[in-house]
Amino acid sequence: EDELQVIQPEKSVSVAAGESATLRCAMTSLIPVGPIMWFRGAGAGRELIYNQKEGHFPRVTTVSELTKRNNLDFSISISNITPADAGTYYCVKFRKGSPDDVEFKSGAGTELSVRAKPS
């Protein structure tokens, strides 16, 4: 079995409305080759949050703060959080395939909860 692991270190993150949420994801390898995408929710109805290769995601920026020798950082930050952003976010590794990429491995997910904006 190949040892690529998808690590989402935080089970949950709580952010005040209007602030930014950082969702952390690390992987132990680039192999197998293929893209990394972020989704909210699981299964057929999941929502694509970020795909670096294609699409327009104006509220999402990539954050690679701490470079470690033994893993690769694929974290994102979502700006201007609203209650509608609450949910569980998954960092997903795909394997390059023909004609379509194949889902290879998902992180355990990070639940984002949104607090009311401080008055």
Epitope: E1, D2, E3, L4, T28, S29, L30, I31, P32, V33, I36, Q52, T62, V63, S64, T67, R69, N70, N71, L72, D73, F74, S75, I76, R95
Partner: antibody, heavy 118, light 111 residues
Framework: EVQLVESGGGLVKPGGSLRLSCAAS????????MSWVRQTPGKGLEWVAT????????YYPDSVKGRFTLSRDNAKNSLYLQMNSLRAEDTAVYYC???????????WGQGTTVTVSS | DIVITQSPASLAVSLGERATISCRAS??????????MHWYQQKPGQPPKLLIY???NLESGVPDRFSGSGSRTDFTLTINPLQAEDVATYYC?????????FGGGTKVEIK
Amino acid sequence: EVQLVESGGGLVKPGGSLRLSCAASGFTFSSYVMSWVRQTPGKGLEWVATISSGGTYTYYPDSVKGRFTLSRDNAKNSLYLQMNSLRAEDTAVYYCASQLTGSEFDYWGQGTTVTVSS
Amino acid sequence: DIVITQSPASLAVSLGERATISCRASESVDSYGNSFMHWYQQKPGQPPKLLIYRASNLESGVPDRFSGSGSRTDFTLTINPLQAEDVATYYCHQSGDLPWTFGGGTKVEIK
């Protein structure tokens, strides 16, 4: 101490075959992506093949695809490159290299020389 | 394929001075804020040795007179101050996309 020791190089005629081996020690071989990189005076360094840590996935550039086959035996800490239908342009020093994250080449062997000539 | 143009091909620098080597990729090698460009040193008769990984990270055991910078398509390796044992050929390498490719090398000599 990390060690990668290549063997199996030599002189072969065009169209012939060779099997290169790389014996690894000093690190957890089964956790590493492994690759071969070759070097010629004319073309510099060229990536040749890569295999995932468990051996499931292999990758090759077009220049060797269909002719070279990379495999590994994690129980023996060994990497193998089967080279068929060799051409003069395959003449090079072949290095075995490890990649902890499948990104940069962390460690390199001393290399083994392959000469393809009639 | 991502083509890497490395310059200069050779460089003569006085001991104690700064040596600067450049690599330009034909397309971005960045992903999620990671820059997949790496630098190696090769001395005659030896294999390449990793110096800098992912654009700017010093490999363990490498002297801190070596540094790397850059992102997307433009990257730089700096040696400051240059010492006699730094005479070697330096290569950059991208692992941002297959096929992985290398620069043509820069031979660094003492002026």
